[in-house]
């Protein structure tokens, strides 16, 4: 058993039926001695009297608030979650394995530019009594500071017959450097509550494979006197870290006709701009990767041909 | 401590084509070691992240963008000071700073190539003949270094009497290579800066 | 105590569908992940699926994938493994079992696929 | 598709200590717990050791279980005739939610 925050505890249980579950001692913060007695949740049924109580903790049921009193007067609570080790590893029902890159990503994270600025997100099926807590550091043996904002509903979604909730925090790292060659991976814990269930989830990565930068900007078209071309030209994104010879990006542009199965010609340039031919009814995309280190592709910016 | 806007003669810098190929050379290398070595340690998320010339070069430091001099978690404490002649500097008005950048990055590159001949001596022992480093990519830091033209003792060779541990020497490659291939991406950056100023 | 019944097992030919079935009793059952093993003849174990407590998740073995259904139902303390497009290679002993670091497992079902 | 490799036979005269390997990988021995069958012809399998070294109640304590890295050992001091069977080591694959993975089995002869 390990304390999560002032008067919340967290009880590990190695999960798998007729187990026997743990000991735990809970004791009543009071000073008094006498005539305590003990109940859990809702419930005026007394489960024990005196300052300490002992309970076997075996499931769910045995899981909650429970409450220390004298006289009709509540001294103090306790409140014990459950976090499941089942099949010799923590049980991860509170959040939806989003599987990309890779089976058990439940955390994904992304940055727009070396500043040390992060976004995290990630997705579940529970609407209700769902409470999430995020820390984050730069290493763990000697952590260096992150600090994170409060975990928000930033999305909702329909998925068949459920409705899926995406969470998402920011976080920046307290002295980033944007130049500087990252050694210790940044490091996101995660701690999620459902209604008596505790679980934990974590990522760690590196700013440099998290980069994904915004879509280029004032995506513009020229057409060429006498051709069937355009010079297509666009600029670094407002996000993007400078000096941009420092930072610098490639792009790819392409041009898709109207239908998903015409051919696409792509071209790809460290420039801001490009000759292309433009075609009738076709739109010119153009997406930016940053030149030196293959993290993700930023999304299209596109501009319809006519 | 950063890299003024100074203004070279025209025309192409001479580094930067060969930090490309560098860059190219050892992210290649890197791909083929992962694949080779895929039930060893090798990917970024299993191994120990380390830098053979941490306190012995501050090429992050020294050829830092006058623009982040400004953002005080870049100016690192550490000093090094490095040899100033060389012939990537095409301009006489590049200034000592820019002489330290450099010759931090030759450093870099000389300690590298130390260390991944001395690796490759070691792995032409491996009666298993698994994996061995790309003649490209050594060929391709010789060039940059040539291109620096810096003056400076060479460094010996290391050799080992004791028996090599193929799984250790092997580990050791993936870890010199993810480390380089950061340094790599880092002089890409710099000579880039240097093009454009 | 723990007891998990198993039924449904028997002799069916290539290309046809069998259902298993998995009766619980002695715990709640609702409250644990079970998953399905098989023991080929004279062969090992070999695991072939697993679900979730509430059945939300649901994984197999890539032998299974697209053919095998893994399913339960709380109420009648149940687990089903519905096997389609059977193949020879699929004749084995079928257990199904709790999951958890201490597991129990039933009696077994021999499936036999054969024309 | 079995990813933890065990002998395929030991053998041993009774009273002698007898031990059965489980070699593994990072991927599953590596990153979770180990546990040890126990399958006598024509039954179940039944649970030997669990948690890598845990015995469940009416297990008998000649058999023992322990784990380093990526290998996990089965030791049964003091083997006797009904120990006589098959047994197999499982873990769990780290990259997989949900899939155990066993051992291909090993055959305990007592001579």
């Known amino acids: 058993i390990w304390e999560l925050k002032k008067d919340v505890y967290v009880v590990e249980l190695d999960w798998y039926p007729d187990a026997p579950g743990e000991m735990v001692v809970l004791t009543c913060d009071t000073p008094e001695e006498d005539g305590i007695t003990w109940t859990l949740d809702q419930s005026s049924e007394v489960l024990g009297s005196g300052k300490t109580l002992t309970i076997q903790v075996k499931e769910f049921g045995d899981a909650g608030q429970y409450t220390c009193h004298k006289g009709g007067e509540v001294l103090s609570h306790s409140l014990l979650l459950l976090h499941k080790k089942e099949d010799g590893i923590w049980s991860t029902d509170i959040l939806k394995d989003q599987k990309e890159p890779k089976n058990k990503t439940f955390l994904r994270c992304e940055a727009k530019n070396y500043s040390g600025r992060f976004t995290c997100w990630w997705l579940t099926t529970i609407s209700t009594d769902l409470t999430f807590s995020v820390k984050s550091s730069r290493g763990s043996s000697d952590p260096q500071g992150v600090t994170c904002g409060a975990a928000t509903l930033s999305a909702e979604r329909v998925r068949g017959d459920n409705k899926e909730y995406e969470y998402s925090v920011e976080c920046q790292e307290d002295s980033a450097c944007p130049a500087a060659e990252e050694s210790l991976p940044i490091e996101v814990m995660v701690d999620a509550v459902h209604k008596l269930k505790y679980e934990n989830y974590t990522s760690s990565f590196f700013i440099r494979d998290i980069i994904k930068p915004d879509p280029p900007k004032n995506l513009q078209l020229k057409p060429l006197k006498n051709s069937r071309q355009v010079e297509v030209s666009w600029e670094y994104p407002d996000t993007w870290s400078t000096p941009h010879s420092y930072f610098s990006l490639t792009f790819c542009v392409q041009v898709q006709g109207k239908s998903k199965r015409e051919k696409k010609d792509r071209v790809f340039t460290d420039k801001t701009s490009a000759t292309v031919i433009c075609r009738k009814n076709a739109s010119i995309s153009v997406r930016a990767q940053d030149r030196y280190y293959s993290s993700s592709w930023s999304e299209w910016a596109s501009v319809p041909c006519s | 401590r950063n890299l003024p806007v100074a203004t070279p003669d025209p025309g192409m810098f001479p580094c930067l084509h060969h930090s490309q190929n560098l860059l190219r050379a050892v992210s290649n290398m890197l791909q083929k070691a992962r694949q080779t070595l895929e039930f060893y340690p090798c990917t970024s998320e299993e191994i120990d992240h380390e830098d053979i010339t941490k306190d012995k070069t501050s090429t992050v430091e020294a050829c830092l963008p006058l623009e982040l001099t400004k953002n005080e978690s870049c100016l690192n404490s550490r000093e090094t000071s490095f040899i100033t002649n060389g012939s990537c500097l095409a301009s006489r008005k590049t200034s000592f700073m820019m002489a330290l950048c450099l010759s931090s990055i030759y450093e870099d590159l000389k300690m590298y190539q130390v260390e991944f001949k001395t690796m490759n001596a070691k792995l032409l022992m491996d009666p298993k003949r698994q994996i061995f480093l790309d003649q490209n990519m050594l060929a391709v830091i010789d060039e940059l270094m040539q291109a620096l033209n810096f003056n400076s003792e060479t460094v010996p060779q290391k050799s080992s009497l004791e028996e090599p541990d193929f799984y250790k020497t092997k580990i050791k490659l993936c870890i010199l290579l993810h480390a380089f291939r950061i340094r790599a991406v880092t002089i890409d950056r710099v000579m880039s800066y240097l093009n454009a100023s | 105590q723990v007891q998990l019944v198993q039924s449904g097992g028997g002799v069916v030919q290539p290309g046809r569908s069998l259902r298993l079935s998995c009766a619980a009793s002695?715990?709640?059952?609702?409250?644990?992940?079970m998953h399905w093993v098989r023991q080929a003849p004279g062969k090992g174990l070999e695991w072939v699926a697993f679900?979730?407590?509430?059945?939300?998740?649901?994984y197999y073995a890539d032998s299974v994938k697209g053919r095998f259904t893994i399913s339960r139902d709380n109420s009648k303390n149940t687990l089903y493994l519905q096997m389609k497009s059977l193949r020879a290679e699929d004749t084995a002993v079928y257990y199904c079992?709790?999951?958890?670091?201490?597991?129990?497992w039933g009696q077994g079902t021999m499936v036999t696929v054969s024309s | 598709s079995y990813v933890l490799t065990q002998p395929p036979s030991v053998s041993g005269t009774p009273g002698q200590r007898v031990t059965i390997s489980c070699s593994g990988g990072r991927s599953n021995i590596g990153s979770n717990t180990v546990k040890w069958y126990q399958q006598l012809p024509g039954t179940a399998p039944k649970l030997l050791i669990y948690g890598n070294d845990q015995r469940p109640s009416g297990v008998p304590d000649r058999f023992s279980g322990s784990k380093s890295g990526t290998s996990a050992s089965l030791a049964i001091t003091g083997v006797q005739a009904e120990d006589e069977a098959d047994y197999y080591c499982?873990?769990?694959?780290?990259?997989?939610?949900?899939?155990?993975?066993f051992g291909t089995g090993t055959k305990v002869t007592v001579l």
């Open positions: 679900i979730r407590y509430d059945g939300s998740n649901k």
């Open positions: 499982q873990s769990y694959d780290r990259g997989f939610t949900g899939s155990r993975v």
């Open positions: 002695g715990f709640t059952f609702s409250s644990y992940g």
């Open positions: 079992t709790t999951s958890g670091s201490y597991d129990y």
